[in-house]
């Protein structure tokens, strides 16, 4: 999902050295930055979240806020500190003139400042309910009394918690942080105010139409009667949850965020902190028929982001818009005509649509999974959600062409049994942001903190790329892809796996410059090959070279073009075994695939040879896909021959551990 190069507007205000000395300049070499929502109508100028550096204490936050007020007052400006953050992020929320931004950015401890902006409920039409008969289907979904060990926090509108469908299941907290409703003639009708939240609470844990019928919920009001909230209100809500968790630690927590606003660095940062405190966050991808990476919290990598599909597993269309898509979406779930509790009466039901409803489904599934296995980490839960999803059922033609390869073709489903998946080696594919077209542009894909990067590949629609490599960054391996001159940009594709007690390293062989090609193998005792990458400095690898096929009996070896450096990902983990599987096609073909068989998991996907007519390689579920340029442009010579190379692994250790438990 979205990393630090998100598509938001960043204004770095230049610091004037001749400032009148009222503000202490930040430490040498650092400049605080200003961010605001890229979507102008959603901006809320006049209210700002001042985010302080990570290690700032509450007392320092309060002192910095007071200093800002004092300095503003000296200049004749009134300011109001609305909230001092601590527990999740250090900082404060301030109401002030935009004229003071330059001053505020120079305060000590300031990391960045973000202008407040709006967030919105993601159901359509969330307040134009079509009441359906309360009894709506005979063959009711009746899972076990699932989710009973889990608490689900809902950040939404107010809710009618005594509705028969959810009575006793939802505790309405006293948290409320909502903006005034728009319009002078707005009539605050209770049932409309409660509509969105009541429906979602019903989808998560309703007795009749709920996914996790045993889950208990807590609601926080961050959306007003028009389904509108603010980034700052949502932040304060997330902080409230963190403080509640610290005061009274309970079992697993799921936080449902059925809302979306423009890309927000601060909202994503707060989600990251909460996720790293062991909380599972599930959010709506957004209903804008757009790239989910342009929205928050959908773009936060630590959040499980959910798009919406209908009963036919097609992406949901909502008026002229529809579900968001792209690499920031983790999976899809039902989100069209979803029946749930209606706040129009205490026994009414209604159908609503949107990515909010889809996210509520996944929050319910997550609650069921966590209730069955309370020790699951966020990474383990996400991998299981992906693993148990229905694969390749969505018609990708609905998505823009450039987004199809990036969008996961996964529809959430409950596991056939909530126990017993422990033996599986789970892997997922993580796409980077697009590098951009400049000659030296690179793209980086990262795995979650408790996942292992087992392989790295790259993809470019133009075919102009210089391959990819795994490199260490902040003590973790990342996957970096390199653009080439004249290229329109590249993607890095990481294969991220759950491999307990793994010790992985990268072995590199420089370009061989010999006719045999470049080779590298895993030479350490007990290390197995999980992935191969190749990277080259030349603009164009010669296409006249024949494919270099792997010598038999050397499974722990990566081979590649003689002008490329080759990188082998070598891992040692208890019981880990891997094998190489190849599928070569002598005639040119736009796509070559090779899949791992049942019981094996795809960890590595690469192409032979790495010549320029190969657009790249990437993993889709358990299949390695190698894409080449349009056949019509390559001709049908041997140049067009491509081999897809899959590395398939399994863990005997995980299998044994699982058998011992059963």
């Amino acid at each position: 999902q979205e990393d630090e190069d998100g598509d938001y507007e960043e204004l770095v205000l230049a610091l004037r050295s001749e400032e009148d000395g009222l503000a202490e300049a930040p430490e040498h070499g650092t400049t605080a930055t200003f961010h605001r929502c890229a979507k102008d109508p959603w901006r809320l100028p006049g209210t700002y979240v001042v985010v302080l550096k990570e290690e700032t204490h509450l007392s320092q936050s309060e002192r910095t806020a007071r200093r800002l007020q004092a300095q503003a007052a000296r200049r004749g400006y009134l300011t109001k500190i609305l909230h001092v953050f601590h527990g999740l992020l250090p900082g404060f929320l301030v109401k002030m003139s935009g004229d003071l931004l330059e001053l505020a950015l120079k305060l000590p401890h300031v990391d960045y400042i973000e202008e407040d902006s709006s967030v919105f409920a993601q159901s359509i039409p969330w307040n134009l309910e079509r009441i359906t008969p309360p009894r709506y289907r005979a063959d009711e979904y009746q899972p076990p009394d699932g989710g009973s060990l889990v608490e689900v926090y809902l950040l939404d509108t107010s809710i009618q918690s005594d509705h028969r469908e959810i009575e006793g299941r939802v505790m309405v907290t006293d948290f409320e942080n909502v903006p005034e409703e728009d319009g002078t003639r707005f009539h605050r009708q209770a049932s409309k105010c409660d509509s969105h939240g009541t429906h979602l609470a019903g989808v998560v844990s309703g007795r009749d139409a709920g996914v996790a019928k045993g889950a208990s919920m807590r609601s926080l009001r961050v959306l007003n009667c028009q389904g509108k909230g603010t980034v700052s209100g949502t932040l304060i809500g997330l902080e409230f949850i963190r403080k509640s968790q610290l005061v009274q630690p309970v079992g697993p927590l799921v936080v449902l965020l059925p809302l979306a606003g423009g890309y927000s660095r601060v909202l994503n940062a707060a989600c990251q902190r909460l996720a790293r405190a062991g909380v599972v966050l599930v959010t709506a991808a957004g209903n804008f028929r757009d790239d989910a990476c342009l929205y928050s919290p959908a773009s936060a990598p630590e959040v499980i982001t959910v798009g919406a599909t209908n009963a036919q597993d097609q992406p949901v269309t909502l008026g002229t818009l529809g579900t968001n898509f792209g690499r920031c979406v983790d999976l899809f779930a039902p989100g069209e005509d979803i029946i749930g509790a209606s706040s129009d009466c205490s026994t009414c039901f209604v159908s609503q649509s949107g990515t909010s409803q889809a996210a509520a489904h996944v929050a319910g599934i997550a609650a069921m999974m966590l209730s069955a296995e309370p020790e699951l980490t966020l990474a383990e839960l996400r991998q299981r959600l992906i693993h148990f999803s229905a694969k390749d059922v969505i018609n990708e033609a609905w998505f823009p062409e450039d987004q199809r390869v990036l969008t996961p073709n996964l529809v959430a489903a409950l596991p056939p049994s909530t126990h017993g998946a422990g033996w599986q080696l789970f892997c997922r594919t993580v796409w980077s942001a697009h590098s951009g077209p400049t000659r030296m542009a690179t793209a980086v894909a990262r795995c979650a903190p408790d996942e292992e990067l087992l392989s790295c590949s790259s993809f470019s629609r133009s075919g102009k790329r210089r391959g990819e490599r795994m490199e260490a960054q902040g003590g973790k391996l990342v996957c970096r892809a390199h653009n080439a001159f004249g290229g329109e940009g590249v993607y890095a594709i990481a294969r991220c796996c759950l491999l307990p007690q793994a010790n992985c390293s990268v072995h590199t062989a420089p370009p061989a410059e010999a006719s045999m090609g470049t080779r590298v193998h895993c030479h350490q005792q007990g290390h197995v090959l999980t992935g191969c990458s190749s990277h080259w400095e030349v603009e164009d690898l010669g296409t006249h070279k024949p494919p270099v096929l792997r010598p038999r009996g050397q499974p722990n070896q990566c081979v590649g073009h003689r002008e490329a450096s080759i990188h082998a990902s070598c891992c040692h983990a208890p019981g880990l075994e891997c094998k190489v599987k190849e599928h070569g096609i002598p005639a040119p073909q736009e796509q070559v695939t090779v899949a791992c068989e049942e019981g094996w998991t795809l960890t590595g996907c690469s192409a032979l040879p790495g010549t320029s007519h190969v657009l790249g390689a990437y993993a889709v579920d358990n299949t390695c896909v190698v894409r080449s340029r349009d056949v019509s442009t390559t001709g049908s010579t041997s140049e067009g021959a491509v081999t897809a190379v899959a590395i398939c692994c399994r863990s005997r250790h995980l299998a044994q551990a699982s058998q011992e438990l059963q």
Epitope: P134, R135, A138, E140, Q142, D145, Q160, S161, D162, R164, E167, G168, R169, V170, M171, V172, A190, R207, D208, C345, S346, T347
Partner: antibody, heavy 115, light 107 residues
């Protein structure tokens, strides 16, 4: 602890009105409404209706035919059931219970309608 | 309205006996069924909710089963304090309705 405490017994003349109260404590009021159920001597249980502590919303049994009104006062955590134009067949024990699922019951209030 | 029919309307049993009471709904109510115990002069007490889930504090000798239209309350080994009247209640639809009751008496 979670409990519903009802007002004391009432003796009323036909045509009069009665108002029974039910004070809730020990749980989150807004998470449940209050159901009212009556039981005539030697008879079974009959649901009269439901009222919300959250927003005052009501749901009445048809049989009440506009004779009954259910209200709540969240400030005192109390629910009320008023029955007008009393008849002798309204003689019963009136119970309040928590929610539609009726997980907790009040001790009951005996209402006798007699001339 | 959904009709709830309980059977038998009364039964005589001895301490230690296994007792079964049935409740039939006039239409499908999924699992929206509760069972109550009422002793003379007392308010009903919830025993089983959602057709089969035991309310906290209720002895394990009480169990409920069924889904759709047919439901059963079973007392595996009748105890002296179990002699009372038992009611089923559906809350699948409003008005919520009760069975006419089953009186369990000492043989």
């Amino acid at each position: 602890q979670v409990q519903l405490v009802q007002s004391g017994a009432e003796v009323k003349k036909p045509g009069a009105s009665v108002k029974v109260s039910c004070k809730a404590s020990g749980y989150s009021l807004t998470s449940y409404g209050i159901s009212w159920v009556r039981q005539a001597p030697g008879q079974g249980l009959e649901w009269m209706g439901w009222v919300s502590f959250y927003n005052g919303q009501t749901n009445y049994a048809q049989k009440l035919q506009g004779r009954g009104t259910m209200t709540t006062d969240p400030s005192t955590s109390t629910a009320y059931m008023e029955l007008r134009s009393l008849r002798s067949d309204d003689t019963a024990v009136y119970y309040c219970a928590r929610g539609y699922g009726m997980s907790i019951w009040g001790q009951g209030t005996t209402v006798t309608v007699s001339s | 309205d959904i009709q709830m029919t309980q059977s038998p309307s009364s039964l005589s049993a001895s301490v230690g006996d296994r007792v079964t009471i049935t409740c039939r709904a006039s239409q499908n109510i999924n699992s929206w069924l509760n069972w109550y115990q009422q002793k003379p002069g007392k308010a009903p007490k919830l025993l089983i909710y959602g057709a089969s889930s035991r309310q906290s504090g209720v002895p394990s000798r009480f169990s409920g089963s069924g889904s759709g239209t047919d439901f059963t309350l079973t007392i595996s080994s009748l105890q002296p304090e179990d002699f009372a009247t038992y009611y089923c209640q559906q809350w699948f639809d409003v008005p919520t309705t009760f069975g006419q009751g089953t009186k369990v008496e000492i043989k």
